[in-house]
Structures are given as C-alpha cells and as structure tokens.
C-alpha cells in the first residue's frame, strides 16, 4: 500500500510542479520594476521570457513580444531553452508515469516493466525540476547583476542638468513560481524513484516448490537466502513463512536490482 501511495503522491506532486513550470514559463512577470527608492512613476514595467509589458496607472496594459531571436541576450535564450527542456521532459515523464501507475492496469504489463517506467519517469521529473530551477536561477542572477549595474549608473549619471528615471528591475512572481514548481517536480521525481524500489519483483523466474515435511509446514524456496555478498535477491533475510495472506504491496516488496540505483 505504501508503494502505491508513494507512487501516486509522486505523480500528483510532479503534475503540480510541471503545471507550475508551464505557468512560470508563460508568465509575464519574470522581472518587475523596482518601486523602492524610485520616483513614483505612473507606469509599471514588467518583463517575461516572451514579451515585455507596461501597465499604466490608467489601467491600460500594453505588451510587446520579442519579435527577434538574434537580438536577444544569450542568457535569456538559455533560460528559455532550460524551461522548454524542463517542460518537455516533464510532459514525457507524466505520460510515462501514467502507464507506470500501480493502480492502472494495462493488459498484462509486468511489474518489472512498471518499475522500470516508474524509475524512468522519476529521473525525467528530477531532470525537469533541475532544468526549471537552473533556468529561474540563471535569470535571477542576471537580474541581480543588472540591478546593481543600474544602481551604480543611478548615482554616477547625475552630473547633467537633466535627470533620467533609471528603471531598475527586481524579482517577479514568475521566479518564485518557477522555484517552487521546480522543487515540487524534483520532489515528485525522487518519490517516483523511491516507489520504484518497492515495485520491483524478485529476480527469481520460477515458482517456489513446497515440500511437506512431517511436523512443520514451511515453504522452502531455493536460493531464498543467498550467500554472504549482501547483493542477493533477499538481502533483508525475510522470513519465508507467512502464515497468512499478503497484500498486493507486500507480495512485491522484496528487494531487487533497482535497490541500489
């Protein structure tokens, strides 16, 4: 049961995370005009990955897309790329994880296949989350650099008679959405990888043979306790005798090759 819960929760957390990454990528408020220590302007500037906007105090908002590829800063292009890669990997991960979900039966899919798919989707979520976090962090770093540069200009460029309002930009809402979403996707991916361990069946390809000895009724499994290396199929020295029915999760809770990823 714990495995199903972990897998399901991992899927849901990743789903929320990827939705957040998509939302952050589409949002216009990656950087917003810094209003602290600034003259009170009747316009508010903010910028996204795809367009820049100006909201006038009258309520009118006007946005202009960046209709150039070559004219954009390399860093902005890199952030765009990271976010898109994160979305694509996340979307594929979601697709794979849907089929890997334990609660969904698709034909006669083996548990080992589901385990592999769970692991694959988990890794995809982890990379997706890292891409988003990296993209947002690169943009944030770019903002901090530009902020201090424009602050320096603010105090050095006052020599002339005419003053210019220097627009400085600070962190926008999209950055926080991106960081949180990336973190959620990462956590979801880790949960999927953890769930994968519990999903994997034993490596033995043959059924257990029962020997009925007089006096005691025990099931003997050849290779049940492997010798000393500790990397066998039953490293936890599980008691073979159950004395009753097992839940679906318990049936598949033996360690496997996926334990030591």
């Amino acid at each position: 049961m714990a495995v199903t819960a972990c897998q399901g929760l991992g899927f849901v957390v990743s789903l929320i995370g990827i939705a957040g990454i998509i939302a952050a990528t589409c949002m216009d408020q990656w950087s917003t005009q810094d209003l602290y220590n600034n003259p009170v302007t009747a316009v508010f500037n903010y910028q996204g990955l795809w367009r820049s906007c100006v909201r006038e105090s009258s309520g009118f908002t006007e946005c202009r897309g960046y209709f150039t590829l070559l004219g954009l800063p390399a860093m902005l292009q890199a952030v765009r790329a990271l976010m898109i890669v994160g979305i694509v990997l996340g979307a594929i991960g979601l697709l794979v994880s849907i089929f890997a979900l334990k609660c969904i039966r698709i034909g006669s899919m083996e548990d080992s296949a589901k385990a592999n798919m769970t692991l694959t989707s988990g890794i995809m979520f982890i990379v997706s989350g890292l891409c988003a976090i990296a993209g947002v962090s690169v943009f944030a770093n770019m903002l901090v650099t530009n902020f201090w540069m424009s602050t320096a200009n603010m105090y050095t460029g006052m020599g002339g008679m005419v003053q210019t309002v220097q627009t400085r930009y600070t962190f926008g809402a999209a950055l926080f959405v991106g960081w949180v979403a990336g973190g959620l996707t990462l956590i979801g991916g880790v949960m999927m990888c953890i769930a994968c361990r519990g999903l994997a069946p034993e490596e033995t390809n043959y059924k257990a043979v029962s020997y009925h000895a007089s006096g005691h009724s025990v099931a003997y499994k050849p290779g049940g306790f492997k010798a000393s290396t500790g990397f066998g199929s039953n490293t936890k020295n599980k008691k073979i005798y159950d004395g009753g029915a097992r839940t679906e999760d318990e049936v598949q809770s033996y360690p496997s090759k996926h334990d030591y990823v």
């Epitope: 003259p39 009170v40 009747a42 500037n45 910028q47 006038e56 009258s58 309002v165």
Partner: antibody
C-alpha cells in the same frame, strides 16, 4: 457616452472645507481613474490629484496634507475634499477621466468655486 | 516635482500658417519599458474645459484633426499645427503624465492676426 459632472457649493468661506462631487456615466470607476484639475481665473491649469481604478490616490505635493480624494463606485461618484481653503482656492474645478497614456481624455464642464467671507 | 516649461507664452499667427510650440521638462518623460514618452497636449478654448489632443507625445486622440502633430522625446517636445484654422485659437498646455505629481506647463496662447 462618457460624461462627467461636477457639483458642490459655489461659495466657501476661508479656512472651511471645500467639497466637490463628480458624478460620472458611460464608464466604470472600477476600471478607470479620475483626476482633479483646477484653474484660477485667468491662470493656467493646476493638477490636484487622481484616484485610480484600484482605489489608490496620488496628490499634488503642496496640497497633500489638506487634500483627499475618494470614490463611491456603486454610485459612480468621486469626491474631492480640500481642507482649510485660502482665497487662492478660488478657481474652476474640473474632474476628468483618465485614459490611455495616463491622459485625461474626457472632462467635466467644471464648477466655479469662490473662496470668500 | 517635474517642472514643465512652455515657449513661447503667446503666439500671433495668420490663418493657414504653420505653427510650432515647445515644451521642455526638467526630467526625462521617456519610459524605457515601452520606449514611450508620457507627455500630453491639451487645447483649451475660451470658456471651455480643456480637450485632449495628443497623448504619449505623438499619439493623436481620436477625432483630433490631422493638422495637429506631436513630436519629441526625453525632455524636449513640440506641438505642430500644419495649417492654423480660426477654431484653433486657444491656449495649449503640455503635461507630464509620467511621474507623480503630474504637472502642467504654463501654456502657449495662440492668437490671430
């Protein structure tokens, strides 16, 4: 169509409060701001303040301590209150709708206010 | 506060003549976000409320005749009337619409010969 109309007393005694109401039609005060401007006889225009669609206000520096602008969205009314007026408060007071570019695109006819004892 | 200076204070013209009037601001009215200048021109005929002519320095308000043109950027702005008509006799005001508190220029009075 867009209309604005100022109303209030035409005569105010010095050191009293001047209150003017601007009743609007043809647009919503939720979406648009309203500015107040005054013009002393034979002189130029003087911007007093603005109340934006979101309810935030900005005032002229010299009058900030004595001026307040508020609105009643449901009644489509904007109120200007200027405390302890002096004789230099004698002017025609206009309210105007704020449009694109923060410009005042529609104006009321104005109300003439005389500050005198 | 931003100081708006208009020149000349009055202007005497003849019908059909081209007229230009100037407006200077003590601070730049250019917004870097959209590269627009937040300067507005108003026309006030005698006994009437002001009327919006030009917003964002060069955008003509709907219904305003094409003979009115606004230009300039940063701190220096110009209103041009390509061919003055009798109905253009009025006082013209420029206004800072960028930094609070908004401020008007002293006005340019257009008179006929």
């Amino acid at each position: 169509q867009v209309q604005l109309k100022e109303s209030g007393p035409g005569l105010v005694a010095p050191s009293q409060s001047l209150s003017i109401t601007c009743t609007v039609s043809g647009f919503s005060l939720i979406n648009y701001g309203v500015s107040w401007v005054r013009q002393p006889p034979g002189k130029g225009l003087e911007w007093l303040g603005v109340i934006r669609g979101d309810g935030n206000t900005n005032y002229q520096s010299a009058l900030r301590s004595r001026l307040s602008i508020r609105k009643d969205t449901s009644k489509s009314q904007v109120f200007l209150k200027l405390n302890s007026v002096h004789t230099d408060g004698t002017a025609t007071y206009y309210c105007a709708k704020v449009g694109r570019g923060n410009a005042m695109d529609h104006w009321g006819q104005g109300i003439s206010v005389i500050v005198s004892s | 506060d931003i100081v708006m200076t208009q020149s000349p204070s009055s202007l005497t013209v003849t019908a059909g003549e081209k007229v230009t009037m100037s407006c200077k601001s003590s601070q730049s009215l250019l917004n870097s976000g959209n590269q627009k200048n937040y300067l507005t021109w108003y026309q006030q005929r005698p006994g009437q409320p002001p009327k919006l002519l030009i917003y964002r320095a060069s955008s003509r308000e709907s219904g305003v005749p094409v003979r009115f043109t606004g230009s300039g950027s940063g701190t220096d702005f110009t209103l041009t009337i390509s061919s003055v008509q009798a109905e253009d006799l009025a006082v013209y005001y420029c206004q800072n619409d960028y930094i609070y508190p908004y401020t008007f220029g002293g006005g340019t009075k257009l008179e006929m010969n």
